[in-house]
Amino acid sequence: EQAPGTAPCSRGSSWSADLDKCMDCASCRARPHSDFCLGCAAAPPAPFRLLWP
């Protein structure tokens, strides 16, 4: 797991300050109010979003 400020979490994950580790964005379905879910919502859901402005 990556520490904040060094490298981003792997694809499909987001940093949780509460838990001090990268967490799976998939878990936001069950726990949408988790702190890291904001980072998941901001991330592009599919690769093609990275290719087109």
Epitope: G12, D18, M23, D24, C25, S27, C28, R29
Partner: antibody, heavy 119, light 111 residues
């Protein structure tokens, strides 16, 4: 290092009661839902009960086989979860494991405590 | 309840070869983005251990010879190349809804 220590198992007669305990360490207990899962040769792995967080008003959920007979509870100050089992039946004979889950995955498992219901 | 059917019930694979285990769900456990299926390993005399989460994501510390795939109702666990220490029973588990259910398990023996 995550540690989960189940205790309280043993031999009990049909219709009897038993309370299982699980003490946890090595992860932020108050942020994790806690589960009891049991395993028997007859039924394999079977989820039994789950308790959520203080912010969820300690919501509980049960397998159909546990409803009305089993009660899950937790003590965040002791990083412990409990399973009160009443009106035990022969089919409740199993190894009982506690396991934390943040949302979907049972991330860690203890060594389990064995429950035998027999006359 | 969602029923998970694993196959085969047991298999024997030669050291270094590929082991493939199937798990079929009685209804879809996937959204358009994620699949809510996990795989666990239980070595003889030990407790279950999480291997793969969300169908294909390896848990921390799990060797890369393990891989998971699938979506909807059909999921697969692959182990390649198998090693002696992979002798175990493997279980799938869904987290789509309550109650969580497990497959019946697949016992892997290394020849």
């Amino acid at each position: 290092e995550v540690k989960l220590g189940e205790s309280g198992g043993g031999l009990v007669q049909p219709g009897g009661s038993m309370k299982l305990s699980c003490v946890a360490s090595g992860f932020p207990f108050t942020k994790y839902w806690m589960n009891w899962v049991r395993q028997s040769p007859e039924k394999g792995l079977e989820w039994v009960a789950e308790i959520r967080l203080k912010s969820d008003n300690y919501a509980t959920h049960y397998a159909e086989s546990a409803k009305g007979r089993f009660t899950i509870s937790r003590d965040d100050s002791r990083s412990s979860v409990y399973l009160q089992m009443n009106n035990l039946r022969a089919e409740d004979t199993a190894i009982y494991y506690c396991s934390p889950t943040y949302a979907d995955t049972m991330d860690y498992w203890g060594q389990g405590t064995s429950v035998t219901v027999s006359s | 309840d969602i029923v998970l059917t694993q196959s085969p019930a047991s298999l024997a694979v030669s050291l270094g070869q590929r082991a493939t285990i199937s798990c079929k769900a009685s209804q879809s456990v996937s959204t358009s983005t994620y699949s809510y299926m996990q795989w666990y390993q239980q070595r003889p005399g030990q407790s279950p251990k999480l291997l793969i989460k969300y169908a294909s994501k390896l848990d921390s510390g799990v060797p890369a010879r393990f891989s998971g795939s699938g979506s909807g109702t059909d999921f697969t666990l692959n182990i390649h190349p198998v090693e002696e220490e992979d002798t175990a029973t493997y279980y799938c588990q869904h987290s789509w809804e309550l109650p969580y259910t497990f497959g019946g398990g697949t016992r892997l023996e290394i020849k």
